[in-house]
């Protein structure tokens, strides 16, 4: 810092007052409709426009410095003159009936050019034709309900599954399994359709011509389909696209319930086989194969014609220099891109963003600085598979690996309005309950409790009562390079629906067309109360992140954790007692391993509650030992076949990227091992992980020991 | 080898209630689907309804609608069969059948109804 | 519901013949049909699956056919083991049902 740059010493706690203060509701109302006149999708000139408009404002707002980082990425976008559809085609392949081809536009937005058309980006080209087989939600268990108890083989048909449960592109990818030749996906009014509330644009429900778009890909954590591993800059080396990480080798289009009747309603072969199977349309829900009666002869066809590109794509990064330690890095990161005017995703979190590098930067404009380094990112081409993070973390892993403390997560600041929703590690949950104890709760019945209150009475722990629930990180969202490769303690929050009262998975309009301004300030937040809270919550978390001397991490929370994740996954291993005594599987290292753990990280606490926060040295030391406990948690040989997942203790679900497993190694060994052909292979793949994972947990005890 | 092991037989009095076990073995109890399916004297077999032991998802027949609760234990790889507001016509065999295509049966269970 | 009607309802034959069950139903079940055969006093077994695919460990003098509304159930040559009931029974459409049965006796 240059001598002339004056550094107010205030007291801290009336720094963090005077940042939270600064957060104005009003503000974020106006950057969300700001950011939402257009669409702004990944890799077009509009969100291009957007990034440089995001890049003045926050060198405005009193930032170092902002710049660009632009890579060149594999996009996926349909034909404009060569629209996608399916149609029902008869003996003579006549189509007797055509699913629409764009959504009805919302009022007032008749006349917006460049609404992308629903589609499945990366769906491969193709126009296959068959009889159609209904696979619910095509989860592993529904190919194991269809294929091992039905009887039905899923080879050379088209499947249709609904929406929800999982991350699409894990519906894609069991199809291919199963031998699909292609998948249509469709939102059912059971998921997407809430009871007693209107259809968009008078209430928040899906219509049903209302369709939602999204990628199917299966990265892995990979990034750049052509790149894995590496950015995509200039000099890169690029994959053949038939040799691409993650793309479907089957056409995928997504429907709306409309189009979906007319599919359904037709169905024959073998009836739902449970109630789980039947959603909310006026159909039998018969999962086939082929269609019934008059139909019976009929075939579906479908008609992709879709595009694979290198594009260019934007990041916005921010910097904000620390006064004490400008080597440690607290970053705060949401994306910019949407599929057509981010409503919710993303601008809700992209204006929640906006306003903390504002209050953050009236705060150094008047003479402070926090005491280490925060990084603000506005990420590009999160849609297509987490591409614009995943390519700056691989172009900065070196020094992140080194000088990152943690990654907040910025997407959707609400998916509904009744509580608070934070996922994060373990060593974020002291940091996360203390916080809201501090924040007033913006929910009606709450006025004068905390946050913390109103969300531990709508969302208890189950397993620990008086605090609030959090949950395990799984995947879908930026922070996946950060927290899955690198191993940089993240978290995020957001304002969420009441779970147990609404079943469907997302707000009913996400990746829609009607994804408005209109539908927040309508329907979910008129007076912006929860973003604001959610602001509070991000900003706060940053701000302690950033500001406090001993880092906010209480490594004893993990100790609880390990121990939880050990009887989970024993319990599962115990369902094979024979098999486990024959092949002499034990988990006694990985215990022992969790006993070492919990005894040292509380030994580590007693230390710390005894520094001598006045030595530089030792506070740096114990701060670096609480920064790295998550990278000591990394493997660098990754997980089977997701060498990109390398956190053993957590990792997205291999059978739903939007889910965390914990034990993933462990688990995944384990899963659905009474099928497999060499149960001796298989068992001994189990004790290998053990090992792995006895082993890690070991390690990173020993990384939390005095250091001499 | 998949087994299918029902309780023992029941005499009741009519309106009162029978539950009726199924014990599986030799397979992974979650994945196939168990129907009950019963049998009265000298007729056709009856199916009663179904339940998905993964998720707990049941279909009923309409005739035995709001009488008929399936219910399953993952844990013991064990389903239920109740059947509450007995009558004398509801004497006969009551079969479990595991696999959509009723793949396996139980032995049967001789439900009683006298008062 | 949809009602399967079995012919004949009694049928009588010898050790080596060749006889066919029909079942025939309300509406169309595609191939939604099962075949089973019970002896007095024992649960039923699956003979045939989809209308035509043996089950295992059923032998191959059994088999099916058919699809819509009418279908059949084949036995090539017939073993004295074979002497029992057949039903047939449709998974189309809820409540699942069975036909009324085929008495196959000794001639």
């Known amino acids: 810092k240059s001598p002339s740059e004056p550094t107010n010493i205030v007291p801290q706690h009336d720094m963090k007052k005077a940042f939270l203060d600064e957060l104005k509701a009003e503000n974020i109302k106006r950057f969300l409709y700001n950011f939402t006149r257009l669409p702004h999708l990944a890799g077009t000139e509009r969100n291009f426009q957007l990034a440089k408009q995001i890049q003045s404002q926050w060198k405005e707002f009193g930032l170092d410095s902002v710049e660009l980082a632009h890579y060149d990425v594999l996009l996926s976008y349909p034909n404009k003159t060569h629209p996608n559809y399916i149609s029902i085609i008869d003996e003579d392949g006549n189509e007797i009936f055509n699913s629409s081809l764009f959504e009805p536009p919302p009022p007032g937005y008749e006349n917006v050019s460049d609404v992308v058309p629903p589609f499945n980006a990366f769906s491969p080209q193709g126009m296959p034709e068959g009889d159609l087989v209904y696979v619910n939600y095509a989860q592993t268990e529904d190919f194991f309900k269809l294929e091992r108890d039905l009887k039905i083989n899923c080879s050379g048909k088209i499947v249709i599954a609904r929406y929800g449960k999982i991350f699409r592109g894990n519906k894609v990818k069991n199809a291919q399994l199963a031998g699909a030749k292609g998948v249509i996906l469709y939102s059912d009014p059971a998921d997407y359709f809430a009871p007693g509330v209107k259809s968009y644009p008078d209430g928040w429900n899906l219509p049903g011509g209302g369709v939602q778009r999204g990628n199917i890909l299966n990265l892995n954590g990979a990034g750049d389909p052509l790149t894995p591993g590496y950015p995509a800059n200039e000099y890169a080396y690029r994959r053949e696209v038939t040799e691409a990480v993650g793309l479907p080798s089957i056409p995928v289009h997504p429907i709306g319930y409309n189009d979906a009747q007319k599919l359904l309603e037709k169905m024959g072969g073998a009836a739902p086989p449970d109630s789980s199977w039947r959603g909310g349309l006026q159909v039998p829900y018969n999962v086939g194969p082929g269609f019934t009666g008059n139909s019976s002869t009929q075939k579906v066809k479908m008609h992709i014609h879709s595009n694979n590109k290198v594009t260019r794509i934007y990041n916005v990064i921010g910097t904000l220099r620390g006064a004490v330690e400008p080597d440690r890095y607290v970053i705060l990161g949401g994306h910019r891109d949407s599929w057509v005017f981010g409503g919710i995703d993303p601008q809700s979190g992209a204006a929640v963003v906006h306003e903390i590098v504002r209050s953050f930067g009236t705060l150094k404009k008047e003479g402070w600085r926090p005491r280490r380094t925060i990084l603000f990112a506005s990420w590009d081409a999160e849609e297509f598979g987490l591409l614009g993070s995943t390519e700056w973390a691989e172009e900065n892993s070196r020094v992140l690996q080194e000088r990152g403390v943690a990654y907040i997560n910025a997407d959707s600041s609400i998916e509904g309005n009744y509580t608070l929703r934070v996922d994060c590690t373990p060593l974020m949950y002291s940091l996360v309950y203390n916080l809201t104890k501090e924040l007033q709760s913006p929910d009606e019945g709450f006025e004068g409790k905390s946050l913390y209150e109103s969300w531990n009475e709508k969302s208890p722990s189950p397993e620990f009562s008086g605090m609030p629930r959090i949950s395990k990180l799984g995947s879908g969202n930026d922070f996946e390079v950060f927290f899955q490769r690198l191993g940089i303690s993240s978290g995020r929050a957001r304002y969420t629906k009441n779970w147990e009262t609404s079943k469907f998975r997302s707000y009913p309009l996400y990746h829609s067309v009607y994804e408005t301004y209109e539908l927040v300030e309508k329907f979910y937040d008129p007076t912006f109360k929860y973003h604001l809270t959610v602001a509070q919550v991000r900003g706060g978390m940053v701000f302690e992140l950033a500001n406090s001397i001993v880092l906010p991490f209480d490594c004893r929370d993990y100790a609880v954790v390990l121990r939880k994740y050990a009887d989970k996954i024993y319990n599962i291993s115990m369902k094979h007692p024979q098999e486990m005594k024959t092949y002499s599987v034990s988990f006694d290292s990985l215990f022992s391993a969790v006993k070492n753990f919990t005894e040292i990280a509380s030994k580590f606490n007693e230390r710390l509650e005894d520094l001598d926060k006045k030595n530089p040295i030792l506070l740096r030391i114990m701060n670096d030992q609480l920064m790295f406990l998550e990278r000591a948690f990394i493997d660098p040989l990754g997980l089977p076949d997701r060498p990109f997942y390398r956190h053993i203790i957590y990792a997205p679900s291999s059978h739903n990227k939007y889910a965390g497993e914990s034990f993933p190694g462990i688990y995944d060994a384990l899963f659905d091992i009474e099928s497999k052909v060499d149960p001796s292979k298989a068992w001994g793949e189990v004790k290998r992980q053990i090992s792995i994972a006895a082993f890690t947990v070991q390690a990173a005890a020993g990384t939390l020991r005095e250091v001499a | 080898q998949v087994q299918l092991v029902q309780s023992g037989a029941e005499v009741k009095k009519p309106g009162a209630s029978v539950k009726v076990s199924c014990k599986a073995s030799?397979?992974?109890?979650?994945?196939?689907?168990m129907h009950w399916v019963r049998q009265a004297p000298g007729q056709r077999l009856e199916w009663m309804g179904n339940i998905n032991p993964n998720n707990g998802g049941t279909t009923y027949s309409q005739k035995f609608q709001g009488r008929v609760t399936i219910t399953v234990d993952k844990s013991a790889s064990t389903a239920y069969m109740e059947l509450s507001s007995l009558r004398s016509e509801d004497t006969a065999v009551y079969y479990c059948a595991a696999g959509w295509n009723f793949d396996y049966w139980g032995q049967g269970t001789l439900v009683t109804v006298s008062s | 519901d949809i009602q399967l009607t079995q012919s004949p309802s009694f049928l009588s034959a010898s050790v080596g013949d060749r006889v066919t069950i029909t079942c025939r139903a309300s509406q169309d079940v595609g191939t939604a049909l099962d075949w089973y055969q019970q002896k007095p006093g024992k649960a039923p077994k699956l003979l045939i699956y989809w209308a035509s695919t043996l089950h295992s460990g059923v032998p191959s003098r059994f088999s099916g056919s058919g699809s819509g509304t009418e279908f059949t159930l084949t036995i090539s040559s017939l073993q004295p083991e074979d002497f029992a009931t057949y039903y047939c029974?449709?998974?189309?459409?809820?409540?699942?049902?069975f036909g009324q049965g085929t008495k196959l006796e000794i001639k």
């Open positions: 029974q449709q998974y189309n459409s809820y409540p699942l049902t």
């Open positions: 030799g397979y992974t109890f979650t994945e196939y689907t």
